[in-house]
């Protein structure tokens, strides 16, 4: 006899029991239910969601069910093999004695099996997309992160190139600073040479000044003593003149009682009768105020009172406003007279200026103006010039029309520089003009090519420094 | 000390082009404006062409402008002078000389041929056929 029994196990697992005579066969399949069920979030036969799958998830996952249908179908072909091997015998008295139980059994295992392998497939089928879908994603995440690798390695490169660049750059401005390093050590090594020779230069002339200075100051007290014994004589002649003139006679001859002692300019001294090149003392017009100068009684039929002379760099003529207003240095030397005086000077008669110029070369030039004269300080002292002849320059040196005095610290040119900061010295700078007398001084060998020296353009050129200028005035009708 | 070396001058036919340069050492180009200026024998040295701000700003004089372009390169503290279209009458000296750029008057826009103190020896430019 023969039965078939269908029931469920302690497990939950479904068994199929067929009961051929004596043998017993029972038949456990394996359940879907094991799988997840459709409401987790990766339903088991749906198309994957757009969610993201973490990819290592992905792979577990993927094992996971592969292990499942190996299992499977190992355990379909030990089932196929058993009932092949060990069951053709059974299996032909079954259909003997039982064809239409025996066959329902069969119909509904195979069924079954069907019914479970089709899910397998199913479920197979839906991993694959998921695997699919993942893998596109992946290919596409990965194809952005190349696209951004090769973007990073542009941007690199980029950098690296910029950076070459740079380093280039460095290493020419370190060249640049070097070169300029070893520039300015020679400089140094250069002044600091000339600053011992001007050292011994000036301590050489220190002692000559000295010694000048006592001459000057014997001189001074000879001449006040000469003055007094010329005084004393006039008075005697005066005297001997009243005496031996007539008490009733009307025509008395006229002689000065009293012989002048204060001169306002080096003419008068010439006219006086000393007519020796020297240091004179001044008197500032309609003042008892004074001032040394040296008068040239040689040149040009003499009487020239030396407004400015330059001849070896001995004074710096970078000065302050009040400095050339007073006047400095010394009139044995290099000196300036003083704007003031020259301004009540030129402001009361009428003045020539002669301007003498020495190059390095030996030669020699002048220029003179038929009138001369200096605005009071109201109108920061401008320079007042007509009637331009002499050697040094057909055209004036000096701009036309003048220019206000200007000084390091006391800006009134027309540049939109300091000409008296960039060029040195006070001047009556244009903008800043073709000449600067005062600027500064440049030995021989070092005075082409200067910014800063001292400039008669129309005689010399841009940028000679000369070697010796002197700047004299005389009135006009002497 | 400052120095301007030119060079560059030399032979050329009519219609040709000549690139001349001025070299200078002893100050930067940024602080400087170049002026090109040339002599003819017999004649009044007269300005051609100059430039500061380092480009910024040229000037040319009417003979030659359209034919002659001033460039600097500060990297190699130079300034060039590029000169087409050449004609007899631009045979002459070439000098280039410097000037502290901010000497300059309110209101002007360039240099009196006085204000530039330093000047080079000069390079010969010759047009002829």
């Known amino acids: 006899y023969s039965n078939f029994r269908k029931s469920v196990d302690s497990t939950g697992r479904r068994q199929y029991q067929v009961q051929n005579g004596p043998c017993s066969y029972t038949f456990l399949l394996p359940e879907t239910d094991s799988c997840r069920s459709s409401s987790s979030p990766y339903m088991s036969n749906a198309v994957q969601r757009d969610a993201p799958l973490d990819y290592d998830d992905s792979v577990q996952r993927l094992q996971v069910l592969e292990n499942i249908l190996e299992n499977n179908t190992q355990w379909l072909m030990k089932l196929e093999n058993y009932i092949q091997d060990n069951m053709k015998k059974e299996m032909v008295e079954i259909q003997q004695n039982v064809v239409q139980n025996q066959t329902a059994v069969m119909i509904e295992i195979g069924t079954s099996l069907l019914n479970q392998t089709a899910a397998q497939t199913r479920k197979l089928t839906d991993v694959e997309a998921q695997v699919l879908n993942q893998t596109t994603r992946l290919e596409l995440q990965l194809l952005q992160h190349s696209i951004s690798t090769n973007k990073l390695e542009k941007q690199i490169l980029d950098q690296t190139s910029e950076i070459n660049k740079l380093q280039n750059k460095n290493s020419f401005l370190e060249q640049k600073v070097l070169d300029m390093e070893g520039k300015h050590s020679e400089q140094l090594q250069s002044m600091k040479e000339q600053k011992d020779e001007l050292q011994v230069l000036v301590s050489k002339q220190s002692s000559v000044i000295d010694e000048l200075e006592k001459k000057l100051v014997t001189a001074t007290v000879n001449n006040s003593l000469l003055q007094k014994q010329q005084h004393d004589l006039m008075e005697t002649v005066n005297s001997l003149l009243t005496m031996m003139s007539s008490p009733n006679s009307k025509s008395s001859v006229a002689i000065r009682k009293e012989e002048q002692t204060t001169f306002r300019d080096c003419a008068e001294i010439f006219k006086s009768g000393l007519t020796t090149s020297g240091i004179y003392t001044l008197t500032f017009p309609n003042s008892t105020e004074e001032i040394k100068a040296y008068c040239d009684m040689d040149v040009g039929g003499g009487g020239w009172t030396v407004i400015q002379h330059r001849e070896d760099g001995s004074v710096d003529f970078q000065r302050t406003w009040k400095e050339y207003k007073e006047g400095f240095g010394s009139p044995l030397g290099e000196y300036w007279l003083g704007n003031e005086f020259v301004s009540q000077l030129t402001g009361q008669h009428r003045y020539v200026l002669k301007i003498q110029l020495k190059d390095w070369e030996g030669n020699e030039a002048h220029s003179l103006y038929d009138h001369f004269y200096l605005a009071g300080e109201e109108s920061n002292y401008r320079i007042h010039l007509t009637g331009l002849t002499g050697t040094a320059g057909k055209i004036s040196s000096i701009s036309q029309p003048g220019s206000d005095f200007s000084t390091k610290d006391s800006d009134n040119d027309k540049c939109i520089c300091k000409c008296s900061q960039m060029l040195s010295g006070g001047w009556w700078f244009d903008a800043c003009g073709p000449s600067n007398l005062n600027g500064q001084y440049y030995p021989q060998k070092q005075n082409t090519n200067k910014f800063n020296g001292i400039k008669w353009y129309y005689w010399k050129g841009s940028g000679y420094s000369l070697k010796a200028t002197t700047m004299m005035i005389r009135p006009a009708d002497f | 000390e400052v120095q301007l070396v030119e060079s560059g001058g030399g032979l050329v036919q009519p219609g040709g082009s000549l690139r001349l340069s001025c070299a200078a050492s002893?100050?930067?180009?940024?602080?400087?404006?170049i002026g090109w200026f040339r002599q003819a024998p017999g004649k009044e040295r007269e300005g051609v062409s100059a430039?500061?701000?380092?480009?910024?700003?040229?000037y040319y004089a009417d003979s030659v402008k359209g034919r002659f372009t001033i460039s600097s390169d500060n990297s190699k503290n130079t300034v060039y002078l590029q000169m087409n279209s050449l004609r007899p009458e631009d045979t002459a000296v070439y000098y280039c000389?410097?000037?502290?750029?901010?000497?300059?008057?309110?209101?002007?826009?360039?240099?009196?041929?006085?204000?530039?103190?330093?000047w080079g020896q000069g390079t010969l430019v010759t047009v002829s056929s």
């Open positions: 002893g100050i930067t180009l940024d602080d400087y404006a």
């Open positions: 000389a410097a000037v502290p750029a901010g000497r300059l008057r309110y209101g002007e826009q360039w240099y009196p041929i006085y204000e530039y103190d330093a």
């Open positions: 430039i500061r701000e380092s480009g910024g700003s040229t």
